[in-house]
């Protein structure tokens, strides 16, 4: 297993609809054709694999398990979007990238993106 640098933004604020997007960029030492990306959430004394996708370079990401994530890839960048977030989902979201094929296997883990989620205030009743 060889180490690889992964960069991601330090902080992201989710939209009022509970959507957060960030870019995960990895320094690929070679020409990988198969890449696996996993988003981990570290908060509340828990570590959770939020979503994971394996993709072939140039193809779109396919997430499993009715995923709350979507994403696209462009070169060594993965644009990740996490949906359906609520205030209690605030936490550190870490991007883990694995170059699966061809060998050698590379693993990179980012420092994490702190995603802040603020639940929208309910609209006041209106006469209009």
């Amino acid at each position: 297993c060889k180490a690889m640098h992964v960069a991601q933004p330090a902080v992201v604020l989710a939209s009022s609809r509970g959507i957060a997007s960030f870019v995960c960029e990895y320094a690929s030492p070679g020409k990988a054709t198969e890449v696996r990306v996993t988003v981990l959430r570290q908060a509340d004394s828990q570590v959770t694999e939020v979503c994971a996708a394996t993709y072939m370079m140039g193809n779109e990401l396919t997430f499993l398990d009715d995923s709350i994530c979507t994403g696209t890839s462009s070169g060594n960048q993965v644009n990740l979007t996490i949906q359906g977030l609520r205030a209690m989902d605030t936490g550190l979201y870490i991007c883990k990238v694995e170059l699966m094929y061809p060998p050698p296997y590379y693993l990179g883990i980012g420092n994490g993106t702190q995603i802040y989620v603020i639940d929208p205030e309910p609209c006041p009743d209106s006469d209009f």
Partner: nanobody, 125 residues
Amino acid sequence: EVQLVESGGGLVQAGDSLRLSCAASGRTFSNYVMGWFRQAPGKEREFVSAISPSGTLTSYTDSVKGRFAISRDNAKKMLYLQMSSLKPEDTDVYYCAAARGPWSARPSLLTYDYWGQGTQVTVSS
């Protein structure tokens, strides 16, 4: 409806390993998020680990990360918890549970509708 029955608990020494199993009945096991929880007498039930419906994604509480491994076999309708490097503080009644909701960023907070009867794990020093 899902019925859950745990097994595999027992008395072990600190540092030993143990594998808990949870047998499920019901046709839709593969649709559920499955979790393990534990509870000591007089204390609140505590989240230990969870696994997504297909088994590709997992979640662990920090105190067991790297020591416990959750897995499932949807064909056999089984859930497992491989516990290694056990500590006296792991002593508890362990419960398996099923939640209908999709996987989330915080599976510990899903609504777990179905629970097993629990299996006792005792770790002596």
